[in-house]
Amino acid sequence: TPEVWVQVRMEATELSSFTIRCGFLGSGSISLVTVSWGGPNGAGGTTLAVLHPERGIRQWAPARQARWETQSSISLILEGSGASSPCANTTFCCKFASFPEGSWEACGSLPPSSDPGLSAPPTPAPILRAD
């Protein structure tokens, strides 16, 4: 069964700056990745970035830089200042659309006892849903 993992990290240099990393553990080819916060995309969540493997990347504040890390994983850096900045208990979700598996989504947030610069290991997150 395909899985999606989400890793959230607070940057040591900028305490209100976050890096989200997401990956897809499956054999299919990824056609789209959507990163949202505040809940799953389409269920109250707000889209931060959309990454397409050929057409490129769209991103919205407070996203600062989204990028593909590998063919099956992405990273997103969020701005650390401003009214729309994330806080420590913000939930981030990543939805991977792939063929032939369909859409898979997982969510995660900063581990409660995280020191700046540290993060939870990139294990599959608890919220997992196939469309």
Partner: antibody, heavy 123, light 107 residues
């Protein structure tokens, strides 16, 4: 037919602010992001940023963060760009141009542009 | 930021000629490139999107090709109305960036 009608030329003093407008017609305003592009003889075309009129979400070129503020009014199908703390470096032609919001759309590019607004900053 | 380099600022051509305008990206942008034509005093007009697809109403003498880092806009059988500036745009990642432009002029 699709039209992006931009506001007229502006002559403003250094240090002032100005708001440029772009009125869209001939399509569903919320189906497309509105982007703004600056053009000067020295730097050519530079992407300033974008707004999604449906959500109000914005994206900015770091170079123009704090300089430009993008807003949109769904009721009048108009996008706005406020430029602050103007200097002579801001003298340019500014264009609005639309980009379809869905990444998997067939037509994925800036397909229509406004006629441009010339901004002159001079004392 | 991704830099889009149009190495030729000017290109001289004659009516009926075939001309190729090139654009090089500083990193792999897949096929996330568009081409625009701009005449003096006018706004840019879309020609090509996703590297090789023609915008509605663009004559078939305009052809786009390339992927990755190297892109080409070819105009076969150049017409006098084709004399203009041509820009490439990458939309692989933000900030979106344009090439400096290539001015097509008569010999």
């Amino acid at each position: 037919q699709v039209q992006l009608q931009q506001s007229g030329a502006e002559l403003v003093r250094p240090g002032a602010s100005v708001t440029l407008s772009c009125k869209a017609s001939g399509y569903t305003f919320t189906d497309y992001e509105m982007h703004w592009v600056k053009q000067t003889p020295v730097h050519g075309l530079e992407w300033i940023g974008a707004i999604d009129p449906e959500t109000g979400g914005t994206a900015y070129n770091q170079k123009f963060k704090g300089k430009a503020i993008l807003t949109a009014d769904k009721s009048s199908s108009t996008a706005y760009m406020e430029l602050r703390s103007l200097t002579s470096e801001d003298s340019a032609v500014y264009y609005c141009t639309r980009w379809i919001t869905t990444v998997v759309a067939t037509l994925y590019y800036f397909d229509y542009w406004g006629q441009g607004t010339t901004l002159t900053v001079s004392s | 930021d991704i830099v889009m380099t149009q190495s030729q600022k000017f290109m001289s051509t004659s009516v009926g000629d075939r001309v190729s305008i090139t654009c090089k990206a500083s990193q792999n942008v897949r096929t996330a490139v568009a081409w625009y034509q701009q005449k003096p005093g006018q706004s840019p007009k879309a020609l090509i999107y996703l590297a090789s697809n023609r915008h509605t109403g663009v004559p078939d003498r305009f052809t786009g090709s390339g992927s990755g880092t190297d892109f080409t806009l070819t105009i076969s059988n150049v017409q006098s109305e084709d004399l203009a500036d041509y820009f490439c745009l990458q939309h692989w990642n933000y900030p979106l960036t344009f090439g400096a432009g290539t001015k097509l002029e008569l010999k």
